[in-house]
């Protein structure tokens, strides 16, 4: 009858599971690119924007060669959980200026949640620990102004784009090593 409900199915092919995660990540990367471009068209950004509550970028030029699958999946999952919180916050507190992007932000949130579920499944199939975030969760207060929420949206989408680009690189390389 198969494994009991709720217990992970042991995968016969971790490459196929990882492949599926890569494709979902690329799909989310495409959505993020598109939404970031829409943001730039509607609300041109004056330079780079940052947000203290966002995770620091996980990568540097030298790190790809030494990546290990457990570390990549754990870090990616933790970072994506943070970005999910930020997207939820944007939808809730972004104000009228971001309301026009609500359908796209909603779709992005749904895809982020789907990728997180896939990563969780992959980690359980590979018997990796489901690590909790090692950083304290910073409460997200309301943006100081309409322009503040626009700057925050630029920062969130820009950071998510880089995180996903790094993730695709790392996962593609790891897949060739499996």
């Amino acid at each position: 009858p198969g494994p009991p409900a709720g217990s992970p199915r042991v995968s016969s092919d971790p490459r196929a599971d990882l492949d599926s995660a890569v494709l979902l990540t690329r799909s989310l990367l495409a959505d993020t690119r598109q939404l970031a471009a829409q943001m730039r068209d509607k609300f041109p950004a004056d330079g780079d924007h940052s947000l203290d509550s966002l995770p620091t970028l996980a990568m540097s030029a030298g790190t790809l060669g030494s990546l290990q699958l457990p570390g990549v999946l754990t870090r990616l999952r933790v970072d994506l959980m943070s970005y999910l919180r930020h997207v939820q916050w944007l939808r809730r507190a972004g104000g009228p200026s971001l309301k026009t992007l609500e359908p796209e932000l909603g779709a992005l949130q749904a895809r982020l949640e789907r990728l997180l579920r896939r990563l969780q499944l992959l980690m359980s199939r590979l018997a990796l620990p489901q690590a909790a975030p090692d950083q304290p969760v910073i409460p997200l207060g309301p943006p100081a102004s309409a322009w503040g929420s626009i700057r925050a949206a630029h920062a969130i989408l820009g950071g998510l784009h880089l995180t996903l680009d790094w993730a695709v690189r790392g996962l593609l390389l790891l897949k060739t090593r499996l």
Epitope: S27, L29, R33, A61, G62, T63, L162, V168
Partner: antibody
Framework: EVQLVQSGAEVKKPGASVKISCKAS????????MDWVKQAPGQRLEWIGD????????IYNQKFTGRATLTVDKSASTAYMELSSLRSEDTAVYYC????????????WGQGTTVTVSS | DIVLTQSPASLALSPGERATLSCRAS??????????IHWYQQKPGQAPRLLIY???NLESGVPARFSGSGSGTDFTLTISSLEEEDFATYYC?????????FGQGTKLEIK
Amino acid sequence: EVQLVQSGAEVKKPGASVKISCKASGYIFRDYNMDWVKQAPGQRLEWIGDINPTIGAPIYNQKFTGRATLTVDKSASTAYMELSSLRSEDTAVYYCARGELAHWYFDVWGQGTTVTVSS
Amino acid sequence: DIVLTQSPASLALSPGERATLSCRASKSVSTEGYSYIHWYQQKPGQAPRLLIYLASNLESGVPARFSGSGSGTDFTLTISSLEEEDFATYYCQHSRDLPPTFGQGTKLEIK
């Protein structure tokens, strides 16, 4: 106008290295990755690797790992490809091309740099 | 690596005729709602030019006589009515996996 302009033709001896530049203009350099493609006479196009201008972190075709090195100079909107330990079969036209990892097609190409390896 | 095989290797047609170029992948390149196949045109002494991306999307500035179709392992580039400037070599490329690879090309010649 979106453009990628590459450095000029090179003639090198076997065992030497070559470094090709690719200057981007007409778009925000950090918004796209830069890919490199080889076209040897009578051979199919061959992808060499890809680099993200913001984070570096190049990925390579295993065939070129260890011999190709991709770098960027963000301030100059310029990407570089260095190929070391040159041999005769490296004689080819090398292209830089604008890409991204989501769909990974190349929508803007440089004019190509001819590298000839001959003793 | 995924191998792309293009056919025919060369094709001689006249202006005004319809051209059908094929690209077959050694494994499926369609998944998660995308078909990761792209088509390029290359003329002698020039860089490749993107025509079609993701199997069927026409790149900006490319004439509407070019179209792409297919899914899974079999893909087609169609030129509905050939113009003089269409005689060139055409390449397909996949981006399903690392590394992306190209087909060997189809040379379209004037009859």
